[in-house]
Interface confidence: medium
């Protein structure tokens, strides 16, 4: 049952072979030295690879994972806040370091960096007011969230704020901009002729990353942004507010950073680690910082701003939320209130602060220079009941299980690295700085990265985003795992997942999504080209159309939220541990890497068809400027044929020959790397993957052939169409070349 994929009965020797096995070869003189070395290597590898301990297989690893342990770890990680850059989070880093050592990892080190973080001023709180014609504040938004029951006396709960907002006290008329998406500003500016210049805009959270909202508002000329959680997006009908249910109360507020880093990491040291001898940019040259004040509020406060709005009516029903207000767009207040203005009071500061990653190593027995990485962040906005500690607790249990096997004498074939990242909430800083520091090792040795942030965002079904190389791994693994879902007793996870979340393209298969960003896999996948994946339990997107989960980044994201409402038995957490841990086990232990390059061929064709159909919305321009996709389709066809032949060779080659095995595995490992363009995407040098990038309009979403997509976006509005279509042609060229070049890495080497 556990013999998944290729030859994955791959437990290796319980200890390294004695060195004397290959010592005899060294007596061969001079010209025979290399032959002797290889001979010794052959003996070592084949012995180790065939010395299988049945006790130490995938099943043993998975059976060791316990829901009760995950529950205990979650409780332990969520009793106080662990904000990045604070003493509490440093202490948790040291605790995790100590426990991972106890669990049996070979080494566990702290990796520290000094990065730009952002905090509210403790004596000068941030708030928004309505002011009358005399400048008197007649209404002020709340300064903090009412703490949940049992947490009233907890200190160091950071009040709601938008991290990296500049200081400022702008005042002006309000304009309601819906979700502040690109299309929302198009509607306002182009259709409704509403000018946001010099206005304070109010936008509802949801649909897209908050940093994109702020960028869009800046480009529209706004002088401040108010973000709020509308019940339409964060209050599921029929569910009570916390603490009686999992809905957002009116005083609850979503924290979060509002950067537009585009993969840069620390804003002051883009491309390089923020170490002791780093050269730091001045704040004016820092990457991705917003230029206008931004502040988040809850729907109690939002109602008091929105109910007075005048000006234009909402353009259509998609602009109306669920508050009992008119959702007028403005600008400004109506009738009696037209002389009143909105004023922001923002006093947060940006500070270079030390952060700490925890890096644990379990050395591989056969290929110690091949790294499989499992990483998730540790820092939270407040208690982190879901984000991140539901993920960190799962990582902790996975480490414990691997450690248990290691203490019994087992080792994985390849090295496994475990990471507890810091400062993810401030822009993926811990993971990015570590990857910048270790980029040369990672690009040569990185096999795969599995992300482990929040294990749950619902309790309906599995959700997986990954490289196409991992599709078959995920399918085969989930077919072997039991579903935790009610009504699927005795059925596989694959079956419940496929039933609840079917693929839109392939019947009988589950949906697997593209990787976007907004989490710690970004630097590994989008910058370095290391095959990556993530898995968590999610909500029913059909019936729950709210964005994320209602209590995301609020003070109400507690242990009790998870234990009472999401996963009382921790069975969904256990399933996620099995998926994440199972993927790591297979990636680190299978003799042949569990990557199927044919799945990349399939999606490349799909993505080429999609981008071609977008381009064909402009048939006249395509003809006028001689735009052809022939080169791209030809490259995809070549990739498909070469991938097919490679897969045939993969079935047939002599797996007892370690040189050939290593060669084939390297071709698989380096395929993802082959999609990296060293020059990066236009204006986004750290997004270097040609097939996937975070959407320019929503960091959370993945876009395929992003260079071509962005060149085509809104092309009809470009001032110089000849130049614009020239860029489309250039991007088609880059994409076609990259696909062809990647294909050739799979060809026979000589």
């Amino acid at each position: 049952m556990w013999n998944l994929l290729h030859e994955t009965d791959s437990a290796v020797a319980t200890a390294r072979r004695p060195r004397w096995l290959c010592a005899g070869a060294l007596v061969l003189a001079g010209g025979f030295f290399l032959l002797g070395f290889l001979f010794g290597w052959f003996i070592k590898s084949s012995n180790e690879a065939t010395n299988i301990t049945p006790k130490h297989n995938m099943k043993a690893f998975l059976d060791e994972l316990k829901a009760e342990n995950i529950k205990k770890f979650l409780y332990n990680f969520t009793q106080i806040p662990h904000l990045a850059g604070t003493e509490q989070n440093f202490q948790l880093a040291k605790q995790i370091q100590s426990q991972w050592k106890e669990f049996g990892l070979d080494s566990v080190e702290l990796a520290h960096y000094d990065v730009l973080l952002s905090y509210p001023n403790k004596t000068h709180p941030n708030y928004i007011s309505i002011i009358n014609e005399d400048g008197n504040e007649i209404f002020n938004t709340s300064l903090f969230e009412p703490p949940p029951p049992g947490y009233e006396n907890v200190s160091d709960i950071v009040p709601p704020f938008s991290a990296f907002s500049p200081q400022g006290m702008p005042e002006g008329d309000l304009v309601y901009v819906n979700y502040a998406r690109t299309e929302d500003f198009f509607k306002l500016e182009r259709d409704m002729k509403i000018n946001c210049s010099g206005k304070i805009v109010i936008a509802r959270y949801g649909k897209v990353f908050r940093g994109n909202k702020v960028k869009n508002a800046q480009l529209a000329g706004a002088k401040g942004v108010i973000l709020y959680s509308d019940p339409a997006d964060y209050f599921a009908p029929g569910v009570k507010s916390y603490p009686d249910g999992w809905n957002l109360p009116g005083g609850g507020v979503q924290r979060g950073n509002i950067l537009n880093l585009n993969g840069a990491g620390d804003p002051l040291t883009p491309g390089y680690p923020a170490n002791e001898y780093a050269y730091r940019r001045g704040i004016a040259e820092a990457v991705g910082l917003p230029s206008i004040p931004v502040h988040p509020i809850g729907y109690y406060d939002a109602q008091k701003l929105l109910e007075k709005m005048g000006g234009s009516a909402p353009p259509d029903s998609s602009w109306r939320g669920s508050l009992k207000v008119p959702y007028n767009v403005g600008p400004g207040f109506t009738g009696n209130f037209s002389t009143q203005k909105v004023k922001m009071h923002i006093h947060s500061t940006n500070e270079v602060t030390r952060i700490y990653n925890v890096i644990g190593t379990l050395r591989g027995a056969v290929e110690p220079d091949r790294y499989v990485i499992l990483g998730g962040h540790r820092d939270s906005w407040v208690f982190g009941g879901i984000d991140p500690q539901s993920g960190a607790a799962v990582v902790h249990e996975i480490v414990r299980s691997f450690g248990t096997l290691k203490k019994e004498g087992w080792r994985p074939r390849r090295t496994i690295l475990f990471a507890s990242w810091d400062a993810e909430e401030f822009g993926l800083l811990g993971s990015t700085e570590w990857a910048e520091e270790n980029s040369r090792l990672l690009q040569e040795r990185g096999v795969a990265y599995i992300n482990a942030d929040s294990s749950i965002e619902g309790n309906y079904t599995l959700r997986v985003d990954c490289t196409p190389l991992m599709y078959s791994l995920v399918h085969n693994l989930t077919k072997e795992l039991k579903s935790p879902d009610e009504g699927f007793e005795g059925k596989s996870l694959y079956e419940s997942w496929t039933k609840k979340s079917p693929s839109p393209e392939f019947s009988g298969m589950p949906r697997i999504s593209k990787l976007g960003s907004g989490n710690d896999f970004e630097v590994f996948f989008q910058r370095l080209g290391i095959a990556s994946g993530r898995a968590r339990y999610t909500k029913n997107w059909e019936t729950n159309k709210f964005s994320g989960y209602p209590l995301y980044h609020s003070v109400y994201e507690t242990y009790e939220l998870v234990e009472k409402f999401y996963d009382p038995m921790f069975k969904y957490h256990l399933t996620v541990a099995q998926v994440r841990g199972g993927m790591v086990f297979e990636l680190a232990n299978s003799i042949v890497l569990p990557f199927d390059c044919r799945d990349y061929a399939v999606v490349l064709r799909k993505y080429a068809d999609k981008i071609y159909s977008i381009s064909m919305k402009h048939p006249q321009e395509m003809k006028t400027y001689s735009v052809s996709f022939d080169s791209l389709f030809s490259a995809v066809k070549n990739f498909t044929e070469i991938a097919s032949k490679f897969s045939e060779r993969l079935q047939d080659f002599d797996k007892s020959n370690p040189i050939v095995l290593r060669m084939m595995n390297d071709q698989l490992m380096f395929l993802e790397r082959a999609f990296i363009d060293p020059l990066g995407l236009p204006d986004r040098p750290f997004y270097r993957h040609v097939i996937y990038a975070p959407s320019s309009h929503n960091k959370y979403a993945g876009e395929s052939f992003p260079g071509i997509y962005d060149a085509l976006f809104d092309i009809e509005s470009k001032v110089d169409p000849s130049k614009a279509w020239g860029e489309v042609k250039r991007q088609i060229y880059v994409a076609a070349f990259t696909v062809q070049a990647a294909a050739e890495t799979l060809s026979e080497v000589a």
Epitope: P146, P231, P237, G250, Y299, K304, S322, L323, K324
Partner: nanobody, 119 residues
Amino acid sequence: EVQLVESGGGLVQPGGSLRLSCAASGFTFSSYWMYWVRQAPGKGLEWVANINHGGSEKYYVDSVKGRFTISRDNAKNSLYLQMNSLRAEDTAVYYCARDSLIVGERGYWGQGTLVTVSS
């Protein structure tokens, strides 16, 4: 748990006055519009008055305009209805009600206090 408790009802002669109070708990009182609603014997519910969260906007049914005054004290989580020049047709059970902020969410009602106007 949301709770609304009315008090101040009783028997009063025509032309007399009463002041109804409503003590609110279990929610952020200052964030909600509040209402007084009444139900006369054998009749349906009738909206009487409502007030916005800050107390700056007040609305009344025509039959009570100039006689009734709705007010609130957010510091005390309390809603009031000052009823002057009472008439026999004002006899009813008076309910304090909290609007929902959210479309489709149910409102909350108190148990009511009986006002009887009779000589």
